[in-house]
Amino acid sequence: MAVTACQGLGFVVSLIGIAGIIAATCMDQWSTQDLYNNPVTAVFNYQGLWRSCVRESSGFTECRGYFTLLGLPAMLQAVRALMIVGIVLGAIGLLVSIFALKCIRIGSMEDSAKANMTLTSGIMFIVSGLCAIAGVSVFANMLVTNFWMSTANMYTGMGGMVQTVQTRYTFGAALFVGWVAGGLTLIGGVMMCIACRGLAPEETNYKAVSYHASGHSVAYKPGGFKASTGFGSNTKNKKIYDGGARTEDEVQSYPSKHDYV
């Protein structure tokens, strides 16, 4: 029961986190104009990963997309990449975790397979959350660097003519959404990994039965008909109780899912 709860809660927390990562990635307010020097501006600037916007006090808002790839700063491209990788991994993780949920029965899927899938989705959520946190942190660092550079320019007269008030940018709402969402996804992933341990079947008598029984032992094997259908496991290459309960095939193929992260 506790395992089901942990798994279910991990799924829900990750779902909320990934929704937040998607929202943060799409939001325009990654950086907002710092109003410290000009709190009575009639024009308010803010920028996202995909476009920059200007809101006039009249109520009119104009947004312009960044219609160039090569002209954009490498850091911005990196942040975009991190957020997209986070979303993709999170989405795949969600898909995998749906089938891994203990409360959902799909055919006669073994607990070991569910444990495998739970662990896989958990790791995906963890990496997804880390990608989001990394992306947001890189952007925040970029903002802090630019903020102090423009502040230095302001007070040393480097900003061109004397009358020019340089526009400085500070943290936008999307950064906080991204940090929280990344954290939630990470927590959800950890919960899924914890749930995975509880899902893996413990040493039970039926294992011994499957080895000591006569030729008709197939009837006692967990998974029933699957043994002869090619769907399920072949006992000679299945390590049923190997930690996370992965097949050898899965153990080999698993890292390749993350080769391009």
């Epitope: 009639a42 024009v43 009249s58 104009e62």
Partner: antibody, heavy 119, light 113 residues
Framework: EVQLVESGGGLVQPGGSLRLSCAAS????????MHWVRQAPGKGLEWVAY????????YYADTVKGRFTLSRDNPKNSLYLQMNSLRAEDTAVYYC????????????WGQGTTVTVSS | DVVLTQSPDSLAVSLGERATINCKSS????????????LTWYQQKPGQTPKLLIY???TRKSGVPDRFSGSGSGTDFTLTISSLQAEDVAVYYC?????????FGGGTKVEIK
Amino acid sequence: EVQLVESGGGLVQPGGSLRLSCAASGFTFSSFGMHWVRQAPGKGLEWVAYISSGSGSIYYADTVKGRFTLSRDNPKNSLYLQMNSLRAEDTAVYYCATSYYYGNALEYWGQGTTVTVSS
Amino acid sequence: DVVLTQSPDSLAVSLGERATINCKSSQSLFNVGNQKNYLTWYQQKPGQTPKLLIYWASTRKSGVPDRFSGSGSGTDFTLTISSLQAEDVAVYYCQNVYSYPLTFGGGTKVEIK
């Protein structure tokens, strides 16, 4: 058709008070910021105050700060300017205008209401 | 506060001739975010309310004759009437719409010579 109609002007003694109103029609009043601009006889335009669509931001010219209070009633499509401690230099035609256009430009103006401060 | 200085105070131009009005700002009105200058030009004919001519320093409002044009960036702006018509006799004002208070220039009176 956008219409702005000012009212409430008149003759008042120095130190007195007056409340100007601006009735708006022909546009979604609650979506736009509103301004008051005045023009003293034979003089140029002087911006007086601004209120944002939801009354979240209100700004005043230094010459009227602390004496004038700007407010709006969106359900009634009305804008108000409460003028206290009036001085002779506040004598002017008061226009209400809206930043209905791009670039914070004041596109629509009322016909104005005259305020005369004199003893 | 942004101070706008208009010059000249008055201008007499022959019909069909070019009229040029200058507006100088004490601070830059250029917004980096959208690369636009937040300066507006108005026309006020005798006994009438002001009328919007140009916003964003150079964008003509729809319905305004194309003989009116705005130019300039940062702190120096110009309103040009390429061929003065009798109906253009008015006072012209520039306005800072970049930061509050939204100050006006002193106005330039355009007359026919």
